[in-house]
Interface confidence: low
């Protein structure tokens, strides 16, 4: 028997420095977790103690904090090289800055293979990107070889900016021939490493013949055997065992997100490459694990540029940006409109001639807007200003909801109106009329939404049974501020870009902004 230790991360999302327990900015260092300096300590400890170790990443290193905003992927290459990752799969967020934003800072700089079998380049890009990412890689580990085959969510064109010269194929269809190729090369230990979410990970384990282990990402799935060590609730045991169509037991793993845990899986193979046993658990990277001093020193050096960045001008406003709770928790506020407009703008993807865009709607809890921005400071808007408006370090995500769920959400928005509570919704691509003289649960008297399947966007009444795409904060997607109906009834959820980054990019693009209060949210009395 031959034993392999797989160490894995996924959806790190730019958390190079240690973070708080909820993966936001570290405040009380004695309680902080994760970060590459702490990860390196643990990885080195395991590498010294165990003979056959692979360190793998299942994608979405990009996007999530000011580190990515400033360094644009160079930080990912630098610190992943420093940690000596063995392989990485491409995630959807690796395309956030377009193909160029992937090629230059990461693909050309990484000293480890970057993989995806289901992304095919065409046209002029094919020669430019050739060899910079691979469908699979055979890695020598001790006296053996292990094949790693990569995959990426086929939804990436809707979630990021891969351009028109990359085709995202069905994962299972694309993986099978690559695995077969590995088999012909006498590679009998094969890991599928990819970024399509836990449901697809399980399907790959079930359907792709010859895959021994699946290491996934995208869905931020936390798996754990026994008592979990922090706040995350396990979606199942670690590893999650799937019985394949040809009768094999295939371990599937994922390690939550944000570098909070290091996935730790021990696999025992027989001489024919069959998995005999698999066990392990994610390791919580808490403050009991010291940060490696050399990596920490490097982090501190890279930080200097970040501190400068946060005070630089992104753009100007010529109007007061009203982000006060007195406005945003009671009525339409222009800060809410600005943020929602930025959220929609960030999700412009012309992927189908029938649609002007795949999504037109935004909702945003008023309680998530934490500060106004005064235009009388020469109109200057900085990252620091935006960090006061959006201090939670969240993301703006894409969900699919039925019209009936949206209706419930808007009823919840005003169910206790007048108490300055955070659930009052700011909107984009939506016109809502409330009648507060009616009883809670029956206060939405008009709800019109902007069409997507149209050449000239216009507002149509919400249809209860139709499925709509909506951009919203991850806080709402997770049921925050009492929006349990969103969490319970959403049909799909893909995590998006860092909130501040979305707004800062929009302001930089627009250069001068002047958002207005324009009748997106109205109040009426009596019959409508």
């Amino acid at each position: 028997a031959w034993e392999l230790t797989i160490l894995h991360t996924n959806d790190v999302h730019s958390r190079l420095e240690q973070t708080s327990e909820d993966s936001s900015k570290c405040v009380n260092a004695s309680r902080c977790m994760g970060g590459v300096a702490r990860l390196f300590t643990k990885v080195q400890q395991i590498r010294r103690a165990e003979p056959n170790v692979l360190l793998l990443d299942a994608g979405d290193q990009y996007q999530g904090t000011i580190w990515f905003t400033v360094y644009k992927g160079a930080e990912v290459a630098h610190f992943m090289n420093a940690l000596r990752y063995d392989a990485m799969a491409l995630g959807n967020h690796e395309f956030d800055n377009g193909v160029e934003g992937l090629i230059e800072p990461l693909l050309k700089e990484a000293k480890f293979p970057i993989l995806s079998a289901n992304i095919k380049a065409k046209g002029p890009l094919a020669s430019q990107i050739s060899g910079l990412y691979l469908p699979y890689k055979v890695l020598p580990v001790g006296d053996e070889v292990v094949g790693i085959v990569g995959y990426t969510s086929k939804e990436t064109p809707f979630l990021s900016n891969p351009g028109t010269n990359l085709v995202f194929e069905d994962e299972i269809t694309a993986l099978q021939p690559e695995v077969d190729k590995l088999k012909t090369l006498n590679v009998n230990k094969i890991i599928a490493l990819g970024h399509s979410g836990f449901e697809m990970d399980k399907l790959i384990a079930q359907k792709v013949r010859g895959v021994d282990v699946v290491v996934g990402g995208h869905s931020n799935t936390f798996l754990y055997t026994g008592n979990p060590p922090s706040k995350e609730v396990p979606a199942g045991k670690y590893p999650f065992i799937v019985t394949s169509d040809d009768g094999r037991k295939v371990p599937v793993v994922q390690a939550y997100a944000f570098g909070k845990y290091l996935g730790y899986l021990k696999i025992e193979f027989d001489e024919r490459g069959n998995v005999i046993s698999s066990h392990g658990n994610p390791i919580l990277l808490n403050s009991s694990i010291p940060e490696d001093p050399s990596i920490k020193a490097d982090i501190n050096k890279w930080r200097i540029k970040l501190d400068n960045y946060s005070t630089q001008e992104l753009g100007k406003t010529i109007v007061y940006l009203d982000g006060s709770s007195q406005s945003c928790r009671f009525r339409e506020c222009n800060m809410g409109n600005l943020i929602c407009d930025a959220m929609i703008n960030n999700n412009l993807r012309h992927t189908d001639e029938m649609f002007w865009n795949h999504v037109s709607m935004c909702i945003l809890n008023g309680g998530g807007i934490r500060s106004p921005i005064d235009e009388r400071n020469n109109g200057t808007i900085t990252w620091e200003n935006l960090a006061a408006v959006l201090p939670f370090g969240g993301t703006f995500d894409l969900v699919q909801l039925k019209g009936s769920t949206l209706k419930k959400a808007f009823e919840h928005s005003v169910h206790r109106y007048g108490q300055s509570t955070g659930e009052f919704l700011q909107v984009g691509g939506i016109h809502v009329v409330y009648d507060l003289s009616r009883k809670p649960g029956d206060r939405v008297v008009k709800l019109d939404v902007l069409c997507t399947k149209c050449r000239v966007p216009s507002y149509d009444p919400l249809k209860m049974d139709e499925v709509y795409k909506v951009i919203l904060p991850n806080f709402l997607a997770n049921g925050g501020d009492g929006f349990q109906m969103i969490k319970d009834e959403l049909l799909r959820h893909d995590s998006g870009d860092q909130d501040i980054n979305v707004v800062s990019t929009y302001i930089s693009k627009m250069k001068v902004i002047y958002p207005a209060v324009e009748g997106r949210i109205k109040f009426s009395t009596g019959s409508h």
């Epitope: 009380n28 008592n227 060590p229 922090s230 201090p391």
Partner: antibody, heavy 122, light 111 residues
Framework: QVQLQQPGAELVKPGASVKMSCKAS????????ITWVKQRPGQGLEWIGD????????NYNEKFKTKATLTVDTSSSTAYMQLSSLTSEDSAVYYC???????????????WGQGTLVTVSS | DIVLTQSPASLAVSLGQRATISCRAS??????????MHWYQQKPGQPPKLLIY???NLESGVPTRFSGSGSGTDFTLNIHPVEEEDAATYYC?????????FGSGTKLEIK
């Protein structure tokens, strides 16, 4: 609803130890820090330390490092504080409290037990 | 450790008037858009009760006559209009860094 139940009183002799309990209900015990606070009669509040039940991770006020030991039993959702080498200075009401901080790291103490009155007397 | 200085130590306010309690920290307790300062009310024989968290956020179920403000090192708790049942001792507490200390308390008496 969230509740933290503490025994009303403990009478202990000088030099002895006491282990007081704090039984939590109405929320996920392993997901929130439990803080312990001391209040001497007619005096203010002193932060002793806290414990994260999910991992057993603890933080102590330097002043109480050798005096207090914080533990938890997750199976019964109970937090414990043991005070050792008791003197009259340790006579006080000891509160356990649940820290908030699910969506932000505010760590405000949103629910409190009724307190245990510890009297050190021979 | 961060020292929190509360003033006044006690005050007497007429029914319906405004009570203002101040809390000064020896070090900045604000960062990343948050002020890590909280206010509690304690009545004799009872445990403290959270009123305000993160400087200005009203805890659920607390009457709106209580409000908090401030950032950096200076924070204020306001009660207006004061009611009979507000007679109590009020404490500020920070959670910016360990250990999380409390202020010495302000006793409010209703005239």
């Amino acid at each position: 609803q969230v509740q933290l139940q503490q025994p009303g009183a403990e009478l202990v002799k000088p030099g002895a130890s006491v282990k007081m309990s704090c039984k939590a209900s109405g929320y996920t015990f392993t997901s929130y820090w439990i803080t312990w606070v001391k209040q001497r009669p007619g005096q203010g509040l002193e932060w002793i330390g806290d414990i994260y039940p999910g991992s057993g991770n603890t933080n102590y006020n330097e002043k109480f490092k050798t005096k207090a030991t914080l533990t938890v039993d997750t199976s019964s959702s109970t937090a414990y504080m043991q005070l050792s080498s008791l003197t009259s200075e340790d006579s006080a009401v000891y509160y356990c409290a649940k820290e908030g901080g699910l969506t932000t790291e505010d760590y405000a103490l949103d629910y409190w037990g009724q307190g245990t009155l510890v009297t050190v007397s021979s | 450790d961060i020292v929190l200085t509360q003033s006044p130590a006690s005050l007497a306010v007429s029914l319906g008037q405004r009570a203002t309690i101040s809390c000064r920290a020896s070090k900045n307790v604000s960062t990343s858009g948050y002020s890590y300062m909280h206010w509690y009310q304690q009545k004799p024989g009872q445990p403290p009760k959270l009123l305000i968290y993160l400087a200005s956020n009203l805890e659920s179920g607390v009457p709106t006559r209580f409000s908090g403000s401030g950032s950096g090192t200076d924070f204020t708790l306001n009660i207006h209009p004061v009611e009979e049942e507000d007679a109590a001792t009020y404490y500020c507490q920070h959670s910016r860094e360990l250990p999380f200390t409390f202020g010495s308390g302000t006793k409010l008496e209703i005239k």
